[in-house]
Interface confidence: low
Amino acid sequence: SGVFQLQLQEFINERGVLASGRPCEPGCRTFFRVCLKHFQAVVSPGPCTFGTVSTPVLGTNSFAVRDDSSGGGRNPLQLPFNFTWPGTFSLIIEAWHAPGDDLRPEALPPDALISKIAIQGSLAVGQNWLLDEQTSTLTRLRYSYRVICSDNYYGDNCSRLCKKRNDHFGHYVCQPDGNLSCLPGWTGEYCQQPICLSGCHEQNGYCSKPAECLCRPGWQGRLCNECIPHNGCRHGTCSTPWQCTCDEGWGGLFCDQDLNYCTHHSPCKNGATCSNSGQRSYTCTCRPGYTGVDCELELSECDSNPCRNGGSCKDQEDGYHCLCPPGYYGLHCEHSTLSCADSPCFNGGSCRERNQGANYACECPPNFTGSNCEKKVDRCTSNPCANGGQCLNRGPSRMCRCRPGFTGTYCELHVSDCARNPCAHGGTCHDLENGLMCTCPAGFSGRRCEVRTSIDACASSPCFNRATCYTDLSTDTFVCNCPYGFVGSRCEFPVGLPPSFPW
């Protein structure tokens, strides 16, 4: 779609005559008829296939034609077409004399024609005017012409439609050649693709308008480069959306179960050793003098009845002291100076001599115990409850109150592998899918921390009177081998000098 434009510039008819040679009276009142048609090698009469146009009377005899385009007038003349410009044309321009005001062809005498010119040739679309001048015997016409495209049409033949738009189908203006020029923030062949926020993740983000970064499901952050973990994930992260990969020390589907309670909560008091034994479960190994689940209770060392053979226990700041009855001596009154002749067995116990009468042993009746059958049997004294369970006397029977992680009549069943405290010497237990693993403290190694690697129980020289000290690696204790003339666990008592008793 375009327009053939014809600009009439000057017409010369000095003698004021018609084509027949007859003069116009009083002068030749001149108007023009224009016919634009397809290319003909010899321009012949016939339909004006590309269009026609007529002018009003523009002047008399000789005159210059004023450029009237700015005022909405008819110069240049416009011959619009609604097809692809073929690049060739034929043009017929006739000058006519108008005796009256009626310019219709049928209203004019046939000899009113002043002059007729016909041209043909090639014409490319463009802004530049082609200047031409046609001369006959009596007249001369100067004019120029060009072909330009209609609004929104571009290209060599005005066949390229381009209309600026800013909607769902594109965001562009048109360049002079009809190519698109994208509006800021848009890209793509037809400027339909928004340019997202700089850095917006190529796969995980998108945008519907420029400088935007909308995240696809499962992603978040300004640039959509952070995955969203599973809803409810407490102590975990993700590398792809909806994952929940647990942080160190946490377990469970949502990483909300604590596998390292000892480290996270430090529940054991008074210097006790803490061992993890499953999810939210732990065991405290108390230092001497303390008891309770968390070793929070201070224990009198005499509570364990360390004094044997009826010895009485006295608490001291640095431990305890046994006051032995006649016939006994030693740290725990464990050494006897009595024999069966002294009737040492109480509560109907029967005496059996040992070592050629130098020692004895009591065989106690039911419900009594002790080296001299001096103690009534407490059903809980045999510690029937395993795994730290608490024994409760219930009249003729007993029952066990189990610690977390253990079950069964005697707390002998462990809920998790760690619940039975398999790690020796204060090792930290970790439940694994197919077993357990012990993390050993300094000085111990082995699958269950059972192997001592550096600590020596004899290092503190616990034996007196030049006794020889031996380390018992299996029990983490020492044994004193006394020289002649000394007895006691530390060889602290001279033989033949039994301790004096206050009674």
Epitope: R160, L161, C162, F169, G170, L180, G188, E189, Y190, Q192
Partner: nanobody, 120 residues
Framework: EVQLVESGGGFVQPGGSLRLSCAAS????????IGWFRQAPGKEPEEISC????????YYADSVKGRFTISRDNAKNTVYLQMNSLKPEDTAVYYC?????????????WGQGTQVTVSS
Amino acid sequence: EVQLVESGGGFVQPGGSLRLSCAASGFTFDDYAIGWFRQAPGKEPEEISCISSSGGITYYADSVKGRFTISRDNAKNTVYLQMNSLKPEDTAVYYCATPGIAACRGIHYWGQGTQVTVSS
């Protein structure tokens, strides 16, 4: 030479239906998107629908959404526009067009048009 030939236009009463066809030749049909636009006397051309080369993406102008359906038959090199619930304001010359690419963007070639008149 690229050719697009529309057919199926005519006179119909309000509420009626028409099915326009666009027969294409001169190019590899299933490489190109095809669309329809219309022009009523004295009005600007209005793009109404388009279908991508694969047929997987379709667009509709708000004025025809829910009433018009575009489809293509790549075996027959033809695109169809099923027009239901026609209104007087749908009266126009309907043109078939292609941008010459797989996506619905721009117009490169178009046909001569087919007249649709909706009146009682």
